[in-house]
């Protein structure tokens, strides 16, 4: 670092000052040098190092008409804003000739009201549930003590005396405020107050009561709320995709849910209007005065099949001598489920209904033995899942084929091992 | 005799630019500070920032931080303002002081002991 | 930022009144506040700084004191000329702040 030597006087006539004040401060040091000749730069130090990015300015006034004669510098240090890093040692440097000079030092201190590194921010928590808060403050001067308060209200005796950095809360059951006084010996600084709201508690053991092909009905135990009473609950449900998938506990869904509201009690709802045989995932969080609680995770459920809730369409019945011809189409109407088969019943006037099980197939011939003198045949056909039948088409009379009606090769349905045809069994 | 005289003012658009001078005699630009300070009409003074001519290092009020631009030529014995994206709220006389500070060998804050004569910028469509 | 409350806004005195003007900073600023005195269409002038020096020039009848958070502006004997708005400013931060402003008018 550069050394002042004494070996001449000093041209300094004004040395800097001392400076002590508190963060953010704007302050200035001067100093003053009287020369002869060319005015030379003057450089600032900091604890012996120059400071090579100095906000200085310089005046340059000539004492004389010649620029031989002396001339009075002064430079000006500006420190914009205050900080522990700015402390410490000041002083001019100037070289001379083959010389450099060193002006007497100032003093720059930090020194003041406790400055906050760390201060509690706001924050929801559960009700009952235990969280921590953290304040930190220093100065100079050393030591800071610090003080909570909870709604105002001091947690400890004295500074110094209760915890002091992080404060640790076993829980609330209300909404409350907290801060921390910083201490030292230059007086108090009070942090910001922090508001801590109390929400519901996640609500527990979401859970299936009851499964409908289109609706299902779930219930769910709610979670402390404090003092403050659940004003309602609100459930999501979701389809579940294959391709996305929905991860337990994931917070937001990917695409926009079903979301209903439950007054509470009772804490039980029933979704309705729901795909039968279909995968969803459901959600419940309450609701408070103060907000709403945590989602629980979410839960994988599924509606049962049902049956198809119409009969099969066009249904066409030919008869041709021993053989009749049915066929039909899919019923339009939602099946609710996989479609398993087809019965198809069959009915004479006078005889008793005769129920065949088609299988998926959707047309039929009947090898009809005998005369097949039965009058007013009538067919209906039903699909059915594994829920059940569902409705019966109306009963068709089936028709005699006439020629020039197209006939379609049909599969026969004959058991081979079964007796010759005697009414009713095909 | 110390002297700060301003010029440029005028009437821009908003989004427009501006660029006012500040010209100093009777004394060296480079030995202080030179403050921009505006006063809306009817109403009080606000600081737009500051510069150290001898530098080139400024400091800059929020209102105007990114949309402003303070320099200085010190051969020119000149500060100018140079004001980009105005608003309708620039709507101002602006003035150029310089900084004076004392002569101790130390100084807490600073006043401003010379003010140009003020130049009006109106910022409208 | 630290803010500046002056008080009053505006009053109404005779000549050769003595007028007081205060200034409230929000936070501690040590001496570092200047006052200064407006005249309408016209730039401000330095009156006092470092809250208690008076600058070269300004007479004898301005005054300024305080340390803190207060700080006051006295005229012992208001003159005619003297009829115009003073602001105070503080300057122990940055950004400088002023007040906003009080208008002394005549009674």
């Known amino acids: 670092a550069p050394r002042g030597t004494q070996a001449e006087e000093s041209p300094f006539v004004g040395n800097p000052g001392n400076i002590t004040g508190a963060r953010g401060l704007t302050g200035t040091l001067r100093c003053q040098l009287q020369v002869q000749g060319e005015p030379p730069e003057v450089h600032w130090l900091r604890d012996g190092q120059i400071l090579e990015l100095a906000d200085s300015t310089q005046t340059q006034v000539p004492l004389g008409e010649d620029e031989q004669d002396d001339w009075i510098v002064v430079s000006q240090l500006r420190i914009a804003s205050l900080q522990l890093s700015d402390a410490g040692q000041y002083q001019c440097l100037v070289f001379l000739g083959h010389q450099n000079f060193v002006s007497q030092p100032g003093y720059v201190g930090l020194e003041g009201l406790p400055y906050f590194l760390e201060e509690p921010e706001d924050r929801t928590v559960a009700a009952n549930t235990p969280f921590n808060l953290s304040c930190q403050a220093q100065g100079p001067p050393e030591p800071v003590d610090l003080l909570w308060l909870q709604d105002a209200v001091p947690l400890a005796t004295a500074p110094g005396h209760g915890p002091q950095r992080n404060l640790h809360v076993p829980g609330l059951n209300k909404t409350s405020s907290f801060s921390c006084e910083a201490h030292n010996a230059k007086g108090v600084t009070t942090s910001r107050t922090a508001t801590i709201t109390v929400l519901p508690q996640q609500p527990r053991n979401l859970h299936l009561v009851s499964r409908q092909p289109t609706e299902l009905e779930v219930a769910w135990t709610p979670g402390l709320s404090g003092i403050y009473p659940l004003t309602h609950c609100t459930l999501q449900a979701m389809l579940s995709d294959n391709e996305v998938g929905i991860q337990a506990g994931e917070p937001d869904p990917p695409e926009e849910p079903l979301t209903l509201q439950a007054s509470v009690p009772p804490h039980q709802l029933r979704l309705g209007s729901l795909h039968p045989h279909t995968p969803y995932h459901i959600r419940v969080a309450c609701t408070s005065s103060q907000g709403l609680s945590s989602w629980t995770h979410w839960l994988p459920v599924e509606t049962p099949e049902g049956v198809p809730l119409g009969p099969p369409e066009n249904i066409s019945a030919t008869r041709n001598g021993s053989q009749a011809f049915v066929h039909w189409q899919e019923p339009r109407a939602p099946l609710q489920g996989t479609l398993l088969g087809y019965r198809l019943a069959y009915q004479g006037q006078d005889t008793p209904e005769v129920l065949m099980d088609i299988g998926l197939r959707q047309e039929v011939t009947l090898e009809l033995q005998g005369d097949g003198s039965v009058s007013n045949l009538t067919v209906c056909v039903a699909a059915y899942t594994a829920a059940g039948d569902g409705p019966w088409s109306l009963p068709v009379p089936l028709e005699a084929w006439r020629p020039g009606q197209a006939q379609p090769v049909h599969q026969l349905v004959k058991e081979t091992s079964a007796p010759a045809f005697s009414w009713p069994w095909w | 005799e110390v002297q700060l005289v301003e010029s440029g003012g005028g009437l821009v658009q908003p989004g427009g630019s501006l660029r006012l001078s500040c010209a100093a005699s009777?004394?060296?630009?480079?030995?202080?500070?030179i403050h921009w300070v505006r006063q809306a009409p009817g109403k009080g003074l606000e600081w737009v920032g500051w510069?150290?001519?001898?530098?080139?290092?400024?400091y800059y009020a929020d209102s105007v931080k990114g949309r402003f631009t303070i320099s200085a030529d010190t051969s020119k014995n000149t500060a100018y303002l140079q004001m980009n994206s105005l608003r309708a709220e620039d709507t101002a006389v602006y003035y150029c002081?310089?900084?004076?500070?004392?002569?101790?060998?130390?100084?807490?804050?600073?006043?401003?002991?010379?003010w140009g004569q003020g130049t009006l910028v109106t910022v409208s469509s | 930022d630290i803010q500046m409350t002056q008080s009053p806004s505006s009053l109404s005195a005779s000549v050769g009144d003595r007028v007081t003007i205060t200034c409230r900073a929000s936070?501690?600023?040590?001496?570092?506040v200047a006052w200064y005195q407006q005249k309408p269409g016209k730039a401000p002038k330095l009156l006092i700084y470092?809250?208690?020096f008076l600058y070269s020039g300004v007479p004898s009848r301005f005054s300024g004191s305080g340390s803190g958070t207060d700080f006051t502006l006295t005229i012992s004997s208001l003159q005619p000329e003297d009829f115009a708005t003073y602001y105070c400013?503080?300057?122990?931060?940055?950004?400088?702040?002023f007040g906003q402003g009080t208008k002394v008018e005549i009674k």
């Open positions: 002081a310089r900084e004076y500070s004392g002569w101790g060998g130390s100084s807490v804050g600073y006043a401003m002991d010379y």
């Open positions: 009777g004394f060296s630009l480079s030995g202080s500070w």
């Open positions: 510069i150290n001519p001898y530098r080139g290092y400024a």
């Open positions: 936070q501690d600023v040590s001496t570092a």
């Open positions: 470092s809250a208690s």
């Open positions: 400013q503080q300057s122990y931060t940055t950004p400088p702040t």
